[in-house]
């Protein structure tokens, strides 16, 4: 049973003889008169397990202590470490030329744990060694124990295992503790990259090249890799890894941003707030959830605030000049937190009876500088219809309008265009012709333009070539023309007025007086 | 809830471990915190355990102090106690919303004297 | 680790009056708002009034009022009570390390 010794976190302890309780039992040659296992107490008093020679007297002394057998476990180059007391033959009468002052360390690697001899050729010699300082018999008085400690180290190893060898050649000798440990790179973390036990290469200037892994919620930047040292020190970090998103460095290690926190990158930032008018409900976000009525734009970027829709204008002025109109308004009072507002108009004409019964305005309306994406808070619209209902309403939108589901963003003014003259009839009809008379009917312009107050009917004969012509007023869209004389050509032009003037003549309409009474329709053309 | 047990009178230089007892949440979601006041002082934060089970010490604390847990409990072992280390012991819930404590235990009153 | 250096050791106040307590930290702390406030009465656990440096902890009266950024935070107990009376402690945190502030004593007079 082993009892537990600390020892540097770099070292892997394969032996340890002051940790074996009860009796070592190594093999000594020859059995007896040799090395002798004696227990002894430490400067704790706790016992311990020791193994002494002092046969000094005789000469040819050659006593081997062979250890158990050691295993390798993938160690390929182990160190030795001996701590032990030795006399100073000086201090020892009438040894002259028999008594030594050091001893001899073998080794011998063997796939077989269970060599019962000692056999002196098999071993190979690791060193001779000699004590740095040696006790005289004052200091057994004194109770001194002057403890001398050596490291040596043999490699590489190929087999599974090894045994130790002390050759004692006539010194006098307490082995007080055997320690064969080798040494790795202890498991490690660096740069968010996690690093294994390395065990120490071959030869004392080796370095072991170790590839680390990422830790947890990491992934590589560059490959992470360290290289693991002769004395178990790592050395020359490469590469790193970063927290994924979501993540964060702490100690070490990768962890989940808190709730109300994001990370949207693999970097090597930390997390941040959520940013205002957004949150996040579980730990580990990538990017935080746009409060109610907040949102965020698809080239937003994560760290941007949630915005919203700006509320409508304010201030809607409207400016008629006959078929034009100018509008101006103020800025919203709320842009929604963001800078890319702008503006739309939206015309619409309404009929005068109903104005809730409104239809687009269509292509034939112009606006300057343009109708959507407006910058300035102005806008002039025209090729407008004199004398319509007009509705025109200003959106304001910015980045994220298209996602508010219950828009409220616009401000409206309804106006009426001016009056103008109106357009030319465009049907002039010759309902019934007799030998005196011609009955007209026609239809409205297509632009009245106004109120139509009346209209004026001009005719004359063909031949008199407008050189003579005589006029008609009526309020209605038909009139009977008397007084004409038979079998004659004329010539009838309609025009209506609003009280901004008369429109244009409509296009000439011929008819021939008959002798026989006849109803026949014009169609603005010529008739006979 | 949190509830500190095992301080008591000791010697300096014996190892004492003081434990944390957790109850109505789980110690796989928050870390925890040892925080300790002298008598008549302020509060010192002594280290934490993370949910992984990795830990991390003021540096102060380093060598000093070893935190440990097992699925309902958290330790913190002082490993040579001076008279210095003579305190009232809170253990401490880091919060999974901001970076501070929620949650602390009564305390445990630790003497350390010969 | 970042050092907290708070002020004053000691405010007196009446009831019903304000005392303001100042916390200074030697760096900006974590997200330039990571700083919490404690109230500690005599043999109690510390009692956590304001986190994220002004956001109030549930059940703690609209009277603590936290605010600041970066390295200099303030604790502002208005309408003084008589219960108000104990010790303060800020906290900040910044990379990987917390600290508390050395306390702030409140007496309500």
């Known amino acids: 049973v082993t009892g537990s010794r600390v020892y540097p976190a770099n070292e892997v302890t394969l032996l340890d003889s002051r940790s074996v309780q009860g009796e070592l039992g190594w093999i000594a040659s020859p059995l007896e008169g040799g090395w002798e296992e004696v227990s002894i107490m430490d400067e704790k008093n706790t016992p311990i397990r020791t193994y002494q020679v002092c046969n000094v007297m005789e000469p040819s002394q050659n006593n081997w202590l062979r250890t158990d057998w050691i295993t390798r476990e993938g160690a390929q180059r182990v160190y030795i470490e001996i701590k032990f007391t030795l006399r100073d033959c000086n201090s020892l009468p009438g040894v002259m030329g028999t008594c030594k002052e050091t001893f001899n360390l073998y080794y011998y690697e063997s796939d077989n744990d269970k060599e019962r001899f000692i056999r002196e050729n098999q071993f190979v010699k690791i060193d001779t060694i000699a004590a740095d300082e040696s006790f005289t018999q004052v200091d057994i008085g004194d109770r001194i124990m002057k403890l001398n400690t050596e490291i040596r180290d043999v490699g590489p190893l190929s087999k599974k295992g090894f045994y130790l060898a002390f050759q004692d050649v006539g010194a006098c000798i307490a082995l007080v503790s055997v320690r064969v440990f080798y040494k790795k790179c202890p498991l490690t973390v660096r740069n968010l990259a996690q690093f294994p036990d390395t065990i120490t290469g071959a030869d004392t200037s080796s370095l072991v090249e170790v590839r680390g892994s990422c830790v947890n919620n990491s992934e590589e930047k560059d490959v992470p890799k360290m290289y693991c040292g002769a004395d178990g020190e790592w050395l020359v970090p490469i590469g790193n890894c970063l927290c994924n998103a979501g993540h964060e460095e702490r100690s070490g290690e990768c962890q989940a941003c808190k709730i109300g926190y994001y990370k949207a990158l693999s970097t090597d930032a930390t997390c941040a707030k959520c940013p205002p008018h957004s949150y996040s409900v579980w730990e580990g976000a990538t990017s935080c959830t746009c409060d109610r009525g907040f949102f965020r734009a698809d080239n937003d970027a994560a760290s941007m605030p949630c915005t919203r829709p700006p509320s409508a204008p304010l201030n809607l002025i409207s400016n008629v000049n006959e078929t034009s109109v100018n509008l101006e308004w103020s800025s919203p009072q709320n842009t929604g937190g963001r800078q890319d507002i702008s503006y739309n108009v939206v015309c619409k004409k309404c009929g005068a009876g109903d104005p809730s019964k409104c239809r687009p305005c269509g292509s034939g309306v112009h606006y300057t500088p343009q109708q959507n994406g407006l910058k300035t808070t102005k806008v002039s619209i025209t090729d407008l219809l004199a004398h319509t209902n007009y509705t025109f309403e200003i959106w304001a939108v910015n980045g994220v309008s298209k996602y508010n589901p219950n828009p409220d963003q616009s401000v409206s003014v309804t106006v009426t265009t001016n009056q103008a003259a109106p357009s030319s009839i465009a049907l002039v009809q010759a309902k019934e012709v007799t030998r005196y008379s011609v009955a007209l009917a026609w239809l409205e312009p297509d632009r009245p333009n106004g109120v139509i107050l009346e209209y004026e009917v001009k005719y004359y004969e063909k031949d008199q070539n407008e050189r003579s012509y005589r006029i008609v007023r009526t309020a209605a869209r038909n009139t009977d023309i008397k007084g004409l004389n038979p079998l004659t050509s004329y010539v009838f032009h309609v025009r209506a007025r609003t009280a901004a003037g008369y429109g244009d003549f409509s296009e000439p309409l011929e008819v021939t007086t008959n002798t026989v009474p006849s109803r026949i329709i014009g169609d603005g053309a010529n008739s006979t | 809830s949190l509830e500190e047990s095992g301080g008591r009178l000791v010697t300096p230089g014996t190892p004492l471990t003081l434990t944390c007892t957790v109850s109505g949440f789980s110690l796989s979601s928050y870390h925890m915190s040892w925080v300790r006041q002298a008598p008549g002082k302020g509060l010192e934060w002594i280290g934490i355990?993370?949910?992984?089970?990795n830990t991390y010490y003021a540096n102060w604390a380093k060598g000093r102090f070893t935190i440990s847990k097992t699925s309902t409990t958290v330790d913190l072992k002082i490993t040579s106690p001076t008279t210095e280390d003579t305190a009232t012991y809170f253990c401490a819930r880091e919060s999974s919303t901001f970076y501070g404590m929620d949650l602390w235990g009564p305390g445990t009153l630790v003497t350390v004297s010969s | 680790a970042i050092k907290m250096t708070q002020t004053p050791s000691s405010v007196s106040a009446a009831v019903g009056g304000t005392v303001t307590i100042n916390c200074q930290a030697s760096q900006s702390v974590y997200g330039n708002n990571e700083l919490a406030w404690y109230q500690q009465k005599p043999g109690q656990p510390p009692k956590l009034l304001i986190y994220?440096?002004?956001s109030l902890a549930s059940g703690v009266p609209s009277r603590f009022k936290g605010s600041g950024s970066g390295t200099e935070f303030t604790l502002t107990i208005s309408d003084l009570e008589c219960a108000d009376a104990a010790t303060y402690y800020c906290?900040?945190?910044?990379?990987?390390?917390?600290?508390f502030g050395g306390g702030t004593e409140v007496v309500v007079k």
């Open positions: 906290l900040g945190y910044k990379s990987d390390d917390y600290t």
């Open positions: 994220t440096a002004s």
């Open positions: 355990i993370y949910r992984s089970g």
